[in-house]
């Protein structure tokens, strides 16, 4: 019997099924990545499937359990940290989330040499942050907004700060706005390379206005959550940086690091701290009007026991076309001479590239160049610099890892990842061991993600760490949508888009279109990554076409596109989504009577404005946790892009760019507005004001709130949310349930 290929194909089609919403909500098709927890040049730790903490030595090929799952289980540990001298492990349990990065936890210290937990002088609970020194086993931790130091885990603690107060003074941890919009960490303390000094930030929130919202809980009366949260134009936190000698902490106590004069003359931010050596530190400062950044290199003065920051070691970075940096101002990566450094900033053509700064920024040597952008510097060794960029084949939504040989002249460049698994892998990140002896590559797509281990000298692949075989097998009988990444050229603007098409897509047919938008400054939605998510389901099962478009204001395509939205948020981002929709209609397979748009957070703002654009293009749309007025959002983020909401600055555009101002225009669209009542980030206030404006304009709309849920709408709310949005879209598109 000879089976014809078509017969085989048909029988395969019969056994294959579309994605279901349940698949998505259950995380059936989620993938795994493998990031080694490096502890030396050739060793890493990894938590095995049975929860043992295993140490792997790449060179000997040996591995052994350093911490038993019995020990992990005895304290219900969900995380661990090995001390650099390998004598102790902290075990983290009772994880309690606070904001995006911050959480509190209980910490136990296990003594690996004695095979038991450390008793005596135990850590208080709950702790806000805890970390080992980079050498030995000193501990620094933050408890009740104060910093403590232990020379050894069993020793009594030395209290470094005493002024910590809830919602008032934060030592060693950021307040809300610094955590979310500046540092993007849960900590604000930094050990020097050999653990001699400990630097920390103190944030004074005494004068910051407080956002208050109800948390309903289960009690008779709701609780009120109070967060010092500076909205645009409001009073900001006051920051100071201190450094203490951890060997003799009581000797002179914490020493404040001076702020550069040109920064201190008006409101300012501290943006990051980088230790260079044990006695040299680099601080970055930013004016409140965020187009001037100063990098200050400070040295320890042994005679005075103080930190000196000479003006000759101040490096200014200024933007004349937008704000300083991309989303954040980039951080320096110092070279072995401990004074020169590599840093990413805009070149004369307006593309973010790696520069080498030896004396002044003006004399910086450009290391990379082209109409693409360097995105991250991973590691600088004596002879190599490893970085990521979107250069390869001119796709801005890709990430490849490159090596530049800085030890030779002229420096030569090699793409480490471009040709490894070209179809499967076009979006990489990397994790390097000490001295870049080895590294792990984590490929996020577009194919199924894969993590591999490589030799840092030869770039040879040593082994596969995680290849998601189970996922690959599970997807064999699933009809996944087709994805394509292409670009539109409109009025000298390049609009990259990703289109997700139903499995049996036929260009001669008409399909409903859903635009998924984020569109925030320095974001990127069109990326060559693997995902099986809600929009995959909508294409696979419900036959929708989904499109994501990166318009003006988005990242990694040069400053012209990025800074186009400077001081006028809510204009071009919306225009570009509308322009793209018109182009998609011209392609001939879109049913122009069934077009929707949805977005979350900034995307909720853009989708709301698009719906209220008066174009008649959109039948319906959804806004999840949208910003509705920039006066309601955080100062650090908002002012970066919009300036201040004052008459002599940019108040007019603050007022013009609200969703409420366009309430009348929602009359001819179906609008679903969704928000969590305990959103600490984009406050419920935003949606409350949209709803009020719509009611006042007598415009009908649909709404859903999620009680006690934050900006992420997690847990059971996620299931409810996506089920609810699915029903809404199917109704809008007249699809049977």
């Amino acid at each position: 019997i000879v089976l014809r290929p078509s017969r085989v194909h048909n029988s395969e089609e019969n056994t294959m099924r579309a994605l279901t919403l349940k698949d998505i909500l259950n995380g059936t098709f989620s993938y795994k990545t493998f990031f080694p927890n490096w502890i030396s040049g050739q060793e890493y730790l990894h938590q095995s499937a049975d929860n043992n903490i295993v140490l792997y030595n790449i060179e000997t090929g040996q591995s052994y359990t350093i911490l038993s799952n019995r020990t992990m289980k005895s304290v219900n540990a969900s995380n661990y940290g090995l001390s650099p001298d390998r004598q102790f492990v902290y075990l983290e349990s009772d994880y309690s989330k606070l904001w995006r990065y911050s959480y509190t936890a209980t910490y136990y210290i296990y003594d690996l040499s004695n095979g038991e937990f450390v008793r005596g002088n135990e850590l208080p609970r709950p702790i806000q942050y805890l970390c080992w020194s980079p050498v030995g086993s000193k501990l620094a931790y933050v408890y009740q907004n104060n910093i403590y130091l232990k020379q050894r885990p069993g020793d009594p603690p030395f209290q470094i700060t005493f002024n910590g107060r809830e919602n008032k003074i934060f030592n060693g941890i950021p307040d809300w706005v610094y955590e979310e919009e500046m540092l993007a960490t849960k900590y604000a303390l930094w050990w020097s390379p050999n653990g001699k000094f400990l630097a920390y930030a103190e944030f004074n929130d005494t004068d910051i206005p407080v956002i208050a919202y109800s948390y309903y809980g289960d009690e008779q009366y709701p609780r009120t959550i109070n967060i010092p949260y500076p909205k645009a134009g409001a009073k900001n936190p006051v920051v100071r940086i201190f450094i203490i000698d951890t060997t003799y902490p009581a000797y002179v106590g914490p020493q404040e690091v001076p702020v550069p004069a040109m920064i201190a003359s008006s409101d300012y931010y501290f943006s990051w701290l980088t230790w260079v050596t044990d006695e040299r530190v680099c601080l970055q400062w930013l004016k409140r009007v965020q187009n001037v950044s100063v990098l200050s290199i400070c040295d320890f003065r042994e005679d005075w026991q103080t930190w000196d920051c000479p003006k000759t070691q101040e490096h200014i970075e200024e933007s004349r076309t937008g704000w300083a940096g991309g989303f954040f101002v980039s951080t320096p990566v110092f070279s072995y001479d401990a004074i020169s450094y590599y840093k990413i900033f805009s070149d004369k053509d307006g593309y973010k590239h790696i520069h080498y700064i030896k004396d002044t920024v003006e004399n910086a040597i450009q290391i990379t160049s082209g109409k693409w952008e360097a995105i991250n510097i991973f590691r600088v060794t004596q002879d190599s610099l490893f970085y990521s960029s979107n250069e390869f084949e001119e796709y801005p939504g890709r990430r490849n890892i490159y090596r530049i040989s800085i030890g030779s002249y002229p420096p030569s460049k090699k793409c480490v990842t471009c040709h490894l698994r070209k179809e499967r892998c076009q979006y990489y990140t990397a994790s390097f061991s000490d001295y870049a002896k080895y590294y792990a590559l984590v490929c996020y797509g577009p194919g199924i993600p894969i993590s591999t281990l490589h030799d840092g000298r030869t770039d040879q692949e040593i082994k596969i760490l995680e290849e998601n075989k189970e996922l690959e097998n599970a997807l064999k009988n699933i009809q996944l949508p087709k994805e394509e990444i292409k670009k539109l050229e409109v009025d000298e603007i390049t609009l990259w888009y990703k289109m997700i098409l139903p499995p049996q897509f036929d260009r001669s047919k008409k399909y409903p279109l859903l635009i998924q938008v984020y569109g925030g400054p320095c974001s990127q939605s069109v990326r060559s990554v693997f995902a099986v998510n809600w929009i995959s389901y909508l294409a696979s099962k419900e036959g929708m076409v989904i499109a994501l478009v990166d318009g003006r204001g988005t990242a990694f395509q040069g400053d012209k596109l990025l800074y186009a939205v400077y001081r006028k948020l809510g204009v071009y981002e919306v225009e570009d989504q509308i322009t793209a929709v018109r182009k998609f209609i011209e392609m001939g397979f879109i049913d122009e009577k069934r077009i929707a748009i949805w977005g979350w957070s900034y995307g909720g703002y853009v989708s709301s404005l698009a719906l209220a654009s008066g174009t008649g293009l959109f039948k319906c749309g959804i806004a999840v946790a949208p910003v509705s007025s920039w006066e309601y959002y955080a100062s650090v983020y908002t002012e970066r892009f919009m300036g201040l909401p004052t008459k002599d600055d940019n108040l007019e555009h603050y007022k013009n760019s609200t969703v409420m101002a366009r309430a009348e225009y929602f009359r001819n669209v179906d609008y679903l507005l969704i928000h969590g009542t305990a959103d600490d980030n984009v406050h419920f206030q935003n949606s409350a004001q949209i709803a009020k404006a719509l009611v006042n304009a007598q415009v009908d709309f649909q709404a859903m709130w999620y009680s006690d849920q934050n900006h992420g709408l997690s847990g059971l709310s996620t299931n409810h949310l996506y089920t609810h949005m699915t029903h809404f879209l199917k109704q809008c598109f007249s699809l049977s349930d």
């Epitope: 140490l55 052994y64 359990t65 350093i66 038993s68 019995r70 020990t71 005895s74 304290v75 390998r86 004598q87 136990y108 003594d111 690996l112 040499s113 004695n114 095979g115 038991e116 937990f117 450390v118 008793r119 005596g120 002088n121 069993g154």
Partner: antibody, heavy 124, light 113 residues
Framework: QVQLVQSGAEVKKPGASVKVSCKTS????????IHWVRQSPGQRLEWMGG????????NYNQKFKGRVTITRDKSSSTAYMELSSLRSEDTAVYYC?????????????????WGQGTLVTVSS | DIVMTQTPLSLPVTVGEPASISCKSS????????????LAWYLQKPGQSPQLLIY???TRESGVPDRFSGSGSGTDFTLKISRVEAEDVGIYYC?????????FGGGTKVEIK
């Protein structure tokens, strides 16, 4: 049965080093840490340090730090204690003892089996 | 470091009579999380290595006669021998294993009168 058998008596000159071995049998070597305790004439028992056979990580009494080195050989289930820069006051009987590893948070164990002791005499 | 103080230094006893040794620690050996005292008693018979008698202040090691009992909590501990036998002679040591460095008492020499 459980046994901890130590190497024989040693006579050393001041400034020299001594290495005492402790060969274990009758139990799983990696389930117990090995500790070294010395007893000088007329002095109390003094804990010098210990080692976890699983990972080979030692822990030393600060008093001896820099002079004592504790190692282990997993393949022969043997622990070693080396004391350097010997002086006359190091003349003592040196014992090895085992102590069960405490995996659980509520555990903690005493030294349940001891070696027979090794007399080290430091004399010029 | 935790200092362990034993009394008496020497204890002459009569066979068949009870005996009691005291041990005090410079800080509490009671672990609040499990309500256990991290204290052990050892006996070192003449010419022999120490042998474990009691751990967790009051738990007898297997094979140890029931005439030996330990009591106390926090910083004050006692080892009792209900009826001393000739084979009980030797030096008795208390030891804390609450925290490092592990420390021993100075010892109590029990001898027959």
């Amino acid at each position: 049965q459980v046994q901890l058998v130590q190497s024989g008596a040693e006579v050393k000159k001041p400034g020299a080093s001594v290495k005492v071995s402790c060969k274990t049998s009758g139990y799983t070597f990696t389930e117990y840490t090995i500790h070294w305790v010395r007893q000088s004439p007329g002095q109390r028992l003094e804990w010098m340090g210990g080692i976890n056979p699983n990972n080979g990580i030692p822990n030393y009494n600060q008093k001896f730090k820099g002079r004592v080195t504790i190692t282990r050989d997993k393949s022969s289930s043997t622990a070693y204690m080396e004391l350097s820069s010997l002086r006359s006051e190091d003349t003592a009987v040196y014992y090895c003892a085992r102590r069960r590893i405490a995996y659980g948070y509520d555990e903690g164990h005493a030294m349940d089996y001891w070696g027979q002791g090794t007399l080290v005499t430091v004399s010029s | 470091d935790i200092v362990m103080t034993q009394t008496p230094l020497s204890l002459p006893v009569t066979v068949g009579e009870p005996a009691s040794i005291s041990c005090k620690s410079s800080q509490s050996l009671l672990y609040s999380r499990n309500q256990k005292n991290y204290l052990a008693w050892y006996l070192q018979k003449p010419g022999q290595s120490p042998q474990l008698l009691i751990y967790w202040a009051s738990t007898r090691e297997s094979g140890v006669p029931d005439r030996f009992s330990g009591s106390g909590s926090g910083t004050d501990f006692t080892l009792k021998i209900s009826r001393v036998e000739a084979e009980d002679v030797g030096i008795y040591y208390c030891q804390q294993y609450f925290s490092y460095p592990l420390t021993f008492g100075g010892g109590t020499k029990v001898e027959i009168k």
